[in-house]
């Protein structure tokens, strides 16, 4: 019962996590214009992995895709790659874990097979979550570096009269969504791995040791000891699970749609 619950919960948590990773990857607000000095702005800039956007105070929003591939920073390409790998691994993990769920019967699938599939999906979720966390963290580090660089030359004087204000960017909503989603996927993966241990049929050899007293007399000599031992046949202690006895309701979770402004 506890194993089924752990497995089911792990699946649901991972599902929410992967939905979050997909959402974060698609979101435009990975970096947003820093409004520390000017909380009310007429032009608000924000950027995602795939396009950059400008929201005017008039309400109009204009987004432009990054149509170049070679012209993009290597770090951005790396973040894209990490997020996509995370999504792909997570999606495969979800597919595998659906068939591994104890509450779903597929033909005469052995518990050992389900255990292996659960472990596989768990590892995939862990790697997926780590990819997402790594991707978001790399981007965040890039932002911090750029933030302090642009702060150092916030104003570039032109003839001592004209000022060019450099736009500084700070953490966008997508980073927090990505971190939380990656964490959830990671937790879900760990739960699946824990559930796998409970699913696996344990084959433990308990060697029964029997001591037989010898029929003939034993002469005890100083400094010496002799005893004969007889070993009985090994007995296998096998745990048996009643897989089909109980069925539990399948839990489905749908990611809610948020509008990040």
């Amino acid at each position: 019962m506890a194993v089924t619950a752990c497995q089911g919960l792990g699946f649901v948590v991972s599902l929410i996590g992967i939905a979050g990773i997909i959402a974060a990857t698609c979101m435009d607000q990975w970096s947003t214009q820093d409004l520390y000095n000017n909380p009310v702005t007429a032009v608000f800039n924000y950027q995602g992995l795939w396009r950059s956007c400008v929201r005017e105070s008039s309400g109009f929003t204009e987004c432009r895709g990054y149509f170049t591939l070679l012209g993009l920073p290597a770090m951005l390409q790396a973040v894209r790659a990490l997020m996509i790998v995370g999504i792909v691994l997570g999606a495969i993990g979800l597919l595998v874990s659906i068939f591994a769920l104890k509450c779903i019967r597929i033909g005469s699938m052995e518990d050992s097979a389900k255990a292996n599939m659960t472990l596989t999906s768990g590892i995939m979720f862990i790697v997926s979550g780590l990819c997402a966390i790594a991707g978001v963290s790399v981007f965040a580090n890039m932002l911090v570096t750029n933030f302090w660089m642009s702060t150092a030359n916030m104003y570039t004087g032109m003839g001592g009269m004209v000022q060019t204000v450099q736009t500084r960017y700070t953490f966008g909503a997508a980073l927090f969504v990505g971190w939380v989603a990656g964490g959830l996927t990671l937790i879900g993966g760990v739960m699946m791995c824990i559930a796998c241990r409970g699913l696996a049929p344990e084959e433990t050899n308990y060697k029964a040791v029997s001591y037989h007293a010898s029929g003939h007399s034993v002469a005890y000599k100083p400094g010496g000891f002799k005893a004969s031992t007889g070993f009985g046949s090994n007995t296998k202690n096998k745990k048996i699970y009643d897989g089909g006895a109980r069925t539990e309701d399948e839990v489905q979770s749908y990611p809610s749609k948020h509008d990040y402004v």
Epitope: T41, V43, N45, Y46, S57, S58, G59, V165, T167
Partner: antibody, heavy 118, light 113 residues
């Protein structure tokens, strides 16, 4: 088509308040901010502030902060601008103007002349 | 606040000739996010509200004749009327649309020589 119709001319005494209305038609009123601009006789244009009709949140030019209040009535698609503690230098034509692309003002009201005189 | 300075304050040009009005801002109006300059040009005739001519420094508003064109980037901008018509006689204003408070130039009065 989009139209912005403003209330009639006003004559006020110094220290008094004036409230000008701007009725919008031809578009969804809550979709676009309403800006207010004034022009003193023979002088240039001066931006007073704007208001988001959807949230009712205003943004003011700090020069007028504390004296100007921008409000909206979404049921009648009307924007209001109230200027208090009037001085003679507040004598001007007051315009309401709709927002467009590039934060520009493509649609303007006909203007309301406010005369402050003792 | 961003200060907008227009030059000249008045300009006399013959009909059919080219008219050029300059506008300088105390701060760059170029937005790095979309590489657009947030500068708008208006035309105002006596007794009328201003009329939008160009936004984003060079994008013509619909219905505006193509003899009106805008150029410039950052802090220096120009409004050009390629062939002056009688109906173009008015006061022209440039406006900062990049940061609050929005500010206007003092205006350039265009007259017939």
């Amino acid at each position: 088509q989009i139209q912005l119709v403003q209330s009639g001319a006003e004559v006020k005494k110094p220290g008094a308040s004036v409230k000008i209305s701007c009725k919008a038609s031809g578009y969804s009123f809550t979709d676009y901010h309403m800006n207010w601009v004034r022009q003193a006789p023979g002088k240039g244009l001066e931006w007073i502030g704007n208001i988001d009709p959807y949230y009712g949140s205003p943004t003011y030019n700090h020069k007028f902060k504390g004296r100007v209040t921008l409000t909206v009535d979404t049921s009648t698609s009307t924007a209001y601008m109230e200027l208090s503690s009037l001085r003679s230098e507040d004598t001007a034509v007051y315009y309401c103007a709709n927002y467009g692309r590039g934060n520009s003002f493509p649609y303007w009201g006909q203007g309301t002349l406010v005369t402050v005189s003792s | 606040d961003i200060v907008m300075t227009q030059s000249p304050s008045s300009l006399a040009v013959s009909l059919g000739e080219r008219a050029t009005i300059n506008c300088k801002s105390s701060q760059s109006l170029l937005n790095s996010g979309n590489q657009r300059n947030y500068l708008t040009w208006y035309q105002q005739k006596p007794g009328q509200p201003p009329k939008l001519l160009l936004y984003w420094a060079s994008t013509r508003e619909s219905g505006v004749p193509d003899r009106f064109s805008g150029s410039g980037s950052g802090t220096d901008f120009t409004l050009t009327i390629s062939s002056l018509q009688a109906e173009d006689l008015a006061v022209y204003y440039c406006q900062n649309d990049y940061s609050f408070p929005f500010t206007f130039g003092q205006g350039t009065k265009l007259e017939i020589k």
